[in-house]
């Protein structure tokens, strides 16, 4: 077993020790005090002075060094001889041991190097991992951006194609519009031609009407003459009858004729004791002319003369001025009593007007005017109303002040349009106003958003067409 060790003795000299079996060899290398003394002014690692040493000192120092060198050289030579003479075998072993030791040192150094290399490698791996992470993250971001860019590019492409489609569509529509314009021009031309033809036709009709009017005047004159003749004949007959009426039975029959009861309105009918609702014959004031009217003997004490009723759409209310003047329809159903009769009646005494309304949802409402009358035909049967009460709106749906009556052939409204033609039916149109109870009759589920229906604006608005309406009058003092 051999071992080689390097250490220091108690005074700090270097010593080399070789262990061989049970023998141990120690080599002490000589050192001079001058060399070792830290207090010596000549220590090699002392701070260099600014001023140079004295020459004699230098020479002395060199001499000392030379002698030490000489001693050392001699000592080394002796040692060398000793080793060569006495320790050739051990030398081999020592060399082997030295090689082993150096190998161990080398291995240790190698191990250290390996450890350091491993540490560096680990650090590098860490850095590499970080770089990889960063790279991966960047790659992902790049991928995302790439995808986003692709998506945007696709969207742009889609939009571009959409724009192209729209442009194509636009071009097509433009072409269509141009075609339509051409068609319209042609149509306008044909309409103009039709209009010219119609004007010619109207002119012809006007001349025919004028001729008919002339004939009517002639007929009226003839009629008047005939009426006069008839009147004269009646009087003659009456005189003759009076002269020859000698029997009591004849006298009694004439008396009965003179005492026949006539009713001016339904209030008169009610007062006479006839209190059942139904159709009664009424006589025009100051005249023998008669008309049939429906008397409502139940509502609010009875005695109401019905002047208008809508309930099922069975009667056409788009009528002429003359028809509205004399009346039309069936008094027990849908009808208009007649403007002339109502005008004459309401100018005799003060009347109230009650308008009863029903919607399609089963609701009922009414408007009551405490004073109502119509002007004569000379003033287009203008309506006059005062004192509104009731549940069908606090504002009158018949425009105030009252308007003239208009029909499809008599435009007396305040609109540049012709309300009666546009909204249908005869009414006291303003321009065109908030009501028209003589409008088109619309059935249920078709009765909304109708501008030409049966309208009472302040109860149901402008587009609601009512289910049923009744207009009735009664003397204010009933």
């Amino acid at each position: 077993y051999s071992n080689f060790r390097k250490s220091m003795d108690s005074v700090g000299r270097k010593q080399y020790q070789v262990q061989h079996g049970s023998c141990s060899y120690t080599f002490l290398l000589p050192e001079t005090d001058n060399c070792r003394s830290s207090s010596s002014p000549y220590v090699s690692n002392a701070v260099q002075r600014d001023a140079p040493l004295d020459y004699d000192d230098s020479v002395h120092r060199l001499q000392v060094l030379e002698s030490i060198m000489e001693n050392n050289t001699q000592w080394l030579m002796k040692l060398e001889n000793y080793i060569q003479d006495n320790m050739k075998k051990e030398m081999v072993e020592i060399q082997q041991n030295a090689v082993q030791n150096q190998t161990a040192v080398m291995i240790e150094i190698g191990t250290n190097l390996l450890n350091q290399t491993a540490e560096q490698t680990r650090k590098l791996t860490d850095v590499e991992a970080q770089v990889l992470n960063q790279t991966t993250r960047l790659e992902l971001q790049l991928l995302e951006h790439s995808l986003s860019t692709n998506k945007l590019e696709k969207q742009i492409l889609d939009q571009t194609s959409e724009i192209n489609k729209l442009q194509d569509k636009n071009s097509f529509l433009e072409k269509k519009v141009l075609d339509m314009e051409d068609k319209h021009i042609v149509q306008l031309q044909s309409i103009k031609e039709e209009k010219d033809q119609l004007q010619v036709l109207v002119s012809k009709q006007n001349s025919i009407i004028e001729e008919l009017e002339r004939q009517l005047v002639t007929a009226t004159v003839n009629n008047s003459a005939l009426q006069k003749q008839q009147h004269d004949l009646t009087e003659t007959v009456h005189s003759l009858l009076t002269m020859i009426a000698t029997s009591s039975s004849a006298k009694n029959s004439f008396a009965a004729k003179e005492e026949q009861i006539t009713f001016r309105d339904c209030a008169d009918v009610f007062r006479s004791g006839l209190t059942t609702s139904g159709i009664y014959t009424l006589t025009f004031p100051n005249s023998t002319e008669e008309t049939k009217a429906y008397c409502d003997m139940e509502t609010g004490g009875g005695g109401w003369t019905t002047i208008q009723r809508r309930e099922d759409g069975s009667v056409d209310f788009q009528r002429t001025w003359k028809e509205y003047k004399v009346g039309f329809g069936n008094p027990s159903g849908e009808h208009w009593l007649g403007n002339e009769f109502v005008s004459q009646l309401t100018n005799q005494q003060r009347y109230v007007l009650k308008i009863h309304l029903r919607d399609w949802e089963g609701n009922e409402a009414y408007s009551l005017y405490e004073h109502f009358y119509l002007s004569s035909e000379e003033f287009n049967y203008r309506i006059h109303l005062k004192g509104l009460t009731g549940t069908a709106g606090k504002i009158s749906s018949i425009s105030q002040p009252g308007n003239d009556f208009s029909t499809k052939d008599a435009d007396n409204d305040k609109c540049i349009c012709k309300c009666s033609q546009m909204l249908t039916g005869g009414w006291w149109f303003d321009a065109c106003g908030p009501s028209n109870l003589n409008g088109m009759y619309y059935p249920q589920r078709q009765n909304t958003n109708k501008f030409n229906g049966i309208k009472w604006y302040y109860w149901k608005g402008s587009g609601y067409s009512l289910k049923a309406t009744t207009m009735m009058i009664r003397p204010a003092d009933f």
């Epitope: 504002i395 309300c419 303003d430 106003g433 109708k450 501008f451 604006y457 109860w459 402008s462 587009g463």
Partner: nanobody
Framework: QVQLVESGGGLVQPGGSLRLSCAAS????????MHWVRQAPGKGLVWVSR????????SYADSVKGRFTISRDNAKNTLYLQMNSLRAEDTAVYYC?????????????WGQGTLVTVSS
């Protein structure tokens, strides 16, 4: 000339309240039925509510019934819409409109609208 000017719109949180006003001029306000109509972003016009001329009768769309209240002050020529318990779906431009006598239930004059945004 007839003019209708809405105001009172703005941003409000769900469950919040707003009161819209519509100032009318150029016509006899007390003689006309008035309506509120709204238009959600990208959608069509939807009727919201109406009030008759004297304020005695009102009507509402099912979607706002119980939450919105229409009213009017004829002395001030102003129409109102009180909106409570607002929802995100109430976000829209709100218009007031006049129902003409002969408009067949349609509107002959409109305001310029006021935007109501319901968002948290």
């Amino acid at each position: 000339q007839v003019q209708l000017v809405e105001s009172g719109g703005g941003l409000v949180q769900p469950g919040g309240s707003l009161r819209l006003s519509c100032a009318a001029s150029g016509f006899t306000f007390s003689s006309y039925w008035m309506h509120w109509v709204r238009q959600a972003p990208g959608k069509g016009l939807v009727w919201v509510s109406r009030i008759n001329s004297d304020g005695s009768s009102t009507s509402y769309a099912d979607s706002v019934k119980g939450r919105f209240t229409i009213s009017r002050d004829n002395a001030k020529n102003t129409l109102y819409l009180q909106m409570n318990s607002l929802r995100a779906e109430d976000t829209a431009v709100y218009y007031c409109a006049r129902e003409g006598y002969s408009s067949g239930g349609q509107f002959d004059y409109w305001g310029q609208g006021t935007l109501v945004t319901v968002s948290s």
